[in-house]
């Protein structure tokens, strides 16, 4: 009889331990859920507030029509400049028209003065043709004014109100471009 009671007591104790473990797991799970909920709420809040305050261009970018432009504050070689733009979901500036060129050069005058800024223009080593980064040709009025004497790869840059060319491995500021967000209102 005593053995039977002792076995029952042990079984009850085992059950109690299991229940405590389950309670602990539940508490942990509840805490985890609360944390996730908090994270989700914060994420939603951020998304909503950014959507509410959404301007067509990110902070420190300049807007002109459907485009946003970023004028760098650091120097880099042409290839690194391209990668820096890609990190921001943009590409090096591709100038489509004289109007866009005028806007860019006018903005640069206001911001920084007469420095060199890489744009997304490079010269094909074989054919010598100038091409934008998407493979399109620049319009005749937007070809670099001087041919660089460099034996290395040659890339385009803006200075004052001119489009010029230089060895892609030289260090310059750069300009990134991306589409402006369309307002849903």
């Amino acid at each position: 009889k005593l053995l039977q009671v002792s076995t029952i007591a042990m079984q009850q104790q085992e059950k109690l331990i299991q229940q405590e473990r389950a309670l602990l797991n539940f508490t942990e799970w509840k805490r985890s859920c609360a944390l996730q909920m908090k994270y989700c709420q914060a994420f939603m809040q951020n998304s909503l507030s950014s959507a509410h305050n959404s301007s067509p261009c990110p902070n420190n970018w300049i807007q002109n029509r459907e485009s946003c432009y970023y004028v760098s504050e650091i120097w880099s070689i042409w290839h690194t400049s391209q990668e820096n733009c890609l990190k921001e979901g943009s590409t090096l500036l591709q100038i489509e028209s004289k109007e866009e060129m005028d806007f860019i050069t006018g903005s640069l005058r206001k911001i920084k003065g007469s420095y060199d800024y890489w744009v997304g223009l490079s010269q094909d080593g074989h054919s010598g043709r100038w091409l934008w980064q998407d493979g399109s040709s620049p319009s005749p009025g937007l070809l670099p004014a001087e041919r660089s004497q460099s034996a290395n790869q040659v890339c385009g840059y803006v200075k004052s109100n001119s489009l010029l060319s230089s060895n892609c491995s030289t260090w310059k500021y750069f300009i990134c471009e991306k589409y402006a967000l369309r307002s849903s209102v």
């Epitope: 990668e83 890609l86 990190k87 921001e88 979901g89 943009s90 590409t91 980064q133 998407d134 493979g135 471009e177 991306k178 589409y179």
Partner: nanobody, 115 residues
């Protein structure tokens, strides 16, 4: 963390075509652009093509007119259509995801152009 998985590499004859795919998983909302790089033996890794979230594309001079970068509607998978392949296109091709703070690389897929 972003994971990238490339596929589609292989052996092809000069003038032939291949289509590479790169599937992204993980924190894909942080990706701003995706690109393809390549590295030939004894050479530096170079950018071949890239595409931004907005759809803007960029290509290396050596592949303009031959290679086309694109992505699926969800933006999770990026493709590199390679036409008119040349022996000098032989390399390991790597997929790269650009975020503001960090760049993620795939393991690479071998492309060999030889007759």
């Amino acid at each position: 963390q972003v994971q990238l998985q490339e596929s589609g590499g292989g052996l092809v004859q000069p003038g032939g075509s291949l289509r590479l795919s790169c599937a992204a998983s993980g924190r894909i909302s942080s990706i701003n652009s995706m690109g393809w790089y390549r590295q030939a033996p004894g050479k530096q890794r170079e950018l071949v093509a890239a595409i931004t979230n907005g759809g803007a594309k960029t290509y290396a001079d050596s592949v303009k007119g031959r290679f086309t970068i694109s992505r699926d509607g969800a933006g999770n998978t990026v493709y590199l259509q390679m036409d008119n392949l040349r022996p000098e296109d032989t390399a390991v091709y790597y997929c790269k995801a650009f975020t503001r703070t960090y760049d993620y690389w795939g393991q690479g897929t071998q492309v060999t152009v030889s007759s």
